[in-house]
Amino acid sequence: RAQLERSLRDVVEKTIQKYGTNPEETAAEESWDYVQFQLRCCGWHYPQDWFQVLILRGNGSEAHRVPCSCYNLSATNDSTILDKVILPQLSRLGHLARSRHSADICAVPAESHIYREGCAQGLQKWLHNN
C-alpha cells in the first residue's frame, strides 16, 4: 500500500506540474479535476500546489489562480461567476471523455471561495479503506 500511495502521489504531483501544457493529453488532468470536484479539495498537499503552474500563474501583481474544480460552489452567492464561468466548466466534469483545449482552461483567483484543504489525506483515507 505504501508503494501505491507513493506512485499515486508522484502521478498527481506531475499532473499538477504539467497542467495545461499539452492540449492533446488531458485525460489525467480531467481525472484530477474530477477528483477535486468530487472530494471537495484543491491540490495534492495544499491549494498552493497550483501556484507554481505556469499556465495558471498571473503576471506580476495578478492574483494566483487555481482550476475551477477547486471552486466551492456552496460558499458563494456570486451568480455572475457561477452562471458564466464555473457551472459550464463543472458540468463538463461529468463527461470526462470530451477533449479540452488549453484555451478552455477554467481558473479562478485563489483568494476566492475555493476548497481550503489538499486532496491527499482524503485519497489516502480512501485507499486505506479499500
Epitope: 502521489r9 506531475k14 498537499h45 498552493q48
Partner: antibody, heavy 121, light 111 residues
C-alpha cells in the same frame, strides 16, 4: 539518531551565488518533506523554501522566488539550496529542517545546526 | 513585520506559570490546526515543543501545553524552571502563497 548537517555558507558579494547543502542521516530521507528556514542576526525565524519527498513539488517564499532553487538527491540523502542574485538582506543563518511524521504539515521536528551566509561587499 | 503577533518578552519566577500568545488571522492560526511552537536557546537551533496546536513531541516536558481560541494560539509553561529561559516562536500553515508564517518571537526571562 536523526542528524541534519548544513554546509556551504560563507561570505559572498551582493549579486553573487552560493549553494547550501544539508546532509541527512538516521532516517529514511526519501520519505520526508524538507524545508529551509533562515534567521537574520538578532531577528526571528523566516521560512524560505519547502520540497516534497519526491522532489517534484517545490514552494518558495515570495522574497526568494526566481533567485533561490530548492532540490534534493534522495540517493545521496541530501537537500540543497542554490542561491543566486544574493542581496545584503539575505544575510542569515540558514537551517534545514525535517517535517514531522512523513507528512506535509509544516511542523519541523529536527533541525540542523545552521550555516551562516553573509552577503557583503 | 511578522505575520503572527507575539509579545516581545514575558517573564516569570521559578515555579510560576506563564502564557505566550500568538495572534494571526482566519487564513492561518484561526483557519487551521497546524500551529506549532519552537524553543530556541542562544546560538542553538530551534526545538519543536508543540505541534497541531496542543500536541507534545516525545521527550518534551508536560509542563509545556498549547491551546487555541479563534485567531489566537497560546503556549503555557507551568512550573517555570531556569532552563526554560529562551526565545519562543509560534508558526502556522497559511492559505496565502507564503505557506508558512512565524511569529516575531518572545523572549522568556526566568527571574
Amino acid at each position: 539518531q536523526v542528524q541534519l548537517v548544513e554546509s556551504g555558507g560563507g561570505l559572498v558579494k551582493p549579486g553573487g551565488s552560493l549553494r547550501l547543502s544539508c546532509a541527512a542521516s538516521g532516517f529514511t530521507f526519501s520519505d520526508y518533506y524538507m524545508t529551509w528556514i533562515r534567521q537574520a542576526p538578532g531577528k526571528g525565524l523566516e521560512w524560505v523554501s519547502y520540497i516534497s519527498s519526491s522532489g517534484i513539488t517545490k514552494y518558495y517564499a515570495d522574497f526568494v522566488k526566481g533567485r533561490f532553487t530548492i532540490s534534493r538527491d534522495n540517493a545521496k540523502n541530501s537537500l540543497y539550496l542554490q542561491m543566486n542574485s544574493l542581496r545584503a538582506e539575505d544575510t542569515a543563518v540558514y537551517y534545514c529542517a525535517r517535517d514531522r511524521d512523513r507528512q506535509w504539515l509544516l511542523e519541523f521536528d529536527y533541525w540542523g545546526q545552521g550555516t551562516l551566509v553573509t552577503v557583503s561587499s | 513585520q511578522s505575520a503572527l503577533t507575539q509579545p516581545a518578552s514575558v517573564s516569570g519566577s521559578p515555579g510560576q506559570s506563564i502564557t505566550i500568545s500568538c495572534t494571526g488571522t482566519s487564513s492561518d492560526v484561526g483557519g487551521y490546526n497546524y500551529v506549532s511552537w519552537y524553543q530556541q536557546h542562544p546560538s542553538k537551533a530551534p526545538k519543536l515543543m508543540i505541534y497541531d496546536v496542543s500536541n507534545r513531541p516525545s521527550g518534551v516536558s508536560n509542563r509545556f501545553s498549547g491551546s487555541k481560541s479563534g485567531n489566537t494560539a497560546s503556549l503555557t509553561i507551568s512550573g517555570l524552571q531556569a532552563e526554560d529561559e529562551a526565545d519562543y516562536y509560534c508558526s502556522s500553515y497559511t492559505s496565502s502563497s507564503t505557506l508558512v508564517v512565524f511569529g516575531g518571537g518572545t523572549k522568556l526571562t526566568v527571574l
